[in-house]
Amino acid sequence: KKVVLGKKGDTVELTCTASQKKSIQFHWKNSNQIKILGNQGSFLTKGPSKLNDRADSRRSLWDQGNFPLIIKNLKIEDSDTYICEVEDQKEEVQLLVFGLTANSDTHLLQGQSLTLTLESPPGSSPSVQCRSPRGKNIQGGKTLSVSQLELQDSGTWTCTVLQNQKKVEFKIDIVVLAFQKASSIVYKKEGEQVEFSFPLAFTVEKLTGSGELWWQAERASSSKSWITFDLKNKEVSVKWVTQDPKLQMGKKLPLHLTLPQALPQYAGSGNLTLALEAKTGKLHQEVNLVVMRATQLQKNLTCEVWGPTSPKLMLSLKLENKEAKVSKREKAVWVLNPEAGMWQCLLSDSGQVLLESNIKVLPTW
């Protein structure tokens, strides 16, 4: 008996070939001997089966002795043994129809779980193997689960169902809803304008939700809300904004915030959350602000940084085009009685300058 695998919703063509290369009488029946379709001369006739409106054949092939049964919009319950009667012969074809669906929405938040469920006909014992867009293979039976979805899991999942040494392939498009970056850090000199951008890692036709930026200033004992906003059809509208700092928010995606100036009291870290309509959970992006200030008070030249710096960052003070006078893995450095000239305060990571502030020291007479 020939075995054919089909996919739910697809179209399948079951073949039946006569030895004579001409149009002769044929019938297709199911295992209950109920006629599905056949011919009467050059006319297609249909029986009382459940497939009535979904069954067809190719009249153009009859003259060549081919009498296929075409079943459109396959259903799991179409799984059956189909019998083609032609020239006093019976050709049997076993059709097994499978369906593979994501048990929830195909748009999932980062960190959520994806469950793929296989619908299969009774009596079948298929195995399933799925390959994620990043090349990870998972195997299972009726259900496959992937926990803690990551951004790289966005894309087309290719799943192969194996039954009776036959294969059928499913492709499922999964969109992982996340920000492009989980965390970002902005380095600014005191007084400079600060821009925070929160690009999303996905695109959808219409995006609706609401969000908030909470800020934990290094100098503050507790965090506070800086801004709340709505997102409707991709348009951003501010609901509430703190008066200090005077934040501005863009009305278009990607989400974008502007702080008029970097000040030590704003240095710290923020957490932007975005709750999307009809989704449980929230998207998060952390943003950090490091602020540098170089000052000269009487005979003391000081350079300070505020905000979340890593312990391996180096803070230096140097006279232009000279070796560093002082270099420390600390958040403040100073030079007593500095020489006249242009001094540079540098915040660097393994030799790469992240932030630089210049201050002119005038000669003392």
Epitope: Q193, K232, E235, S237, Q248, K251, K252, H256, T258
Partner: antibody, heavy 118, light 107 residues
């Protein structure tokens, strides 16, 4: 062809009211944000108000906040601007504009003139 | 509100000249900037959006550039029909604000 036709302008005394209308055609009105922009005689352009698509969020310039109300009737493909407590400085040509998908004002009507004078 | 400062307020040029108009925002507005052309007694015409994207039907002699706070509109070779007033518009957030305009006159 996308078209915007303003009407309702005219001469009004200070403190009076006027309602401007803008009839839209040639596009799916309900899916686009719409705005009013004005231009005082011999001056530059000044944004007045915007109403988002079918959500209906409204935004106003500080100079008109509390006095002007923007609204839309999607069933009639019409945008409105209700102007109350009119002042001499509201004298201008008022343009109706359509926003594109990127929220820029891409199509403008020919304008209707509002004169506030005693 | 974000202030938009346009310069120059007026300029005289000849047909064929390269003309540059600048617009400065009082704070960063990404590339959320549009340019409009207005002729006397007419409604403004939309030229450029997202700082550098030409609106369909606008001649390629017009170009825009810039990001953050500084933006430029350039007409590579001025044509007789280009004599008009040009406005920039910040579309970063509300209230939307226009520059005060630059009048391009015939020398």
């Amino acid at each position: 062809e996308v078209q915007l036709l303003e009407s309702g302008g005219g001469l009004v005394q200070p403190g009076g009211s006027l309602r401007l209308s803008c009839a839209a055609s040639g596009f799916t009105f309900s899916t686009y944000a719409m705005s009013w922009v004005r231009q005082a005689p011999g001056k530059g352009l000044e944004w007045v108000s915007t109403i988002s698509d079918n959500i209906g969020n409204t935004y106003y310039a500080d100079s008109v906040k509390g006095r002007f109300t923007i609204s839309r009737d999607n069933s009639k493909n019409t945008l409105y601007l209700q102007m109350n407590s009119l002042r001499a400085e509201d004298t201008a040509v008022y343009y109706c504009t359509k926003d594109n998908e990127d929220y820029y004002m891409d199509v403008w009507g020919k304008g209707t003139t509002v004169t506030v004078s005693s | 509100a974000i202030q938009m400062t346009q310069s120059p307020s007026s300029l005289s040029a000849s047909v064929g000249d390269r003309v540059t108009i600048t617009c400065r925002a009082s704070q960063g507005i990404r590339n959320d900037l549009g340019w409009y052309q207005q002729k006397p007694g007419k409604a403004p015409k939309f030229l450029i959006y997202a700082a550098s994207t030409l609106q369909s039907g606008v001649p390629s002699r017009f170009s825009g550039s810039g990001y953050g706070t500084d933006f430029t509109l350039t007409i590579s070779s001025l044509q007789p029909e280009d004599f008009a007033t040009y406005y920039c518009l910040q579309d970063y957030n509300y209230p939307r604000t226009f520059g005060q305009g630059t009048k391009v006159e015939i020398k």
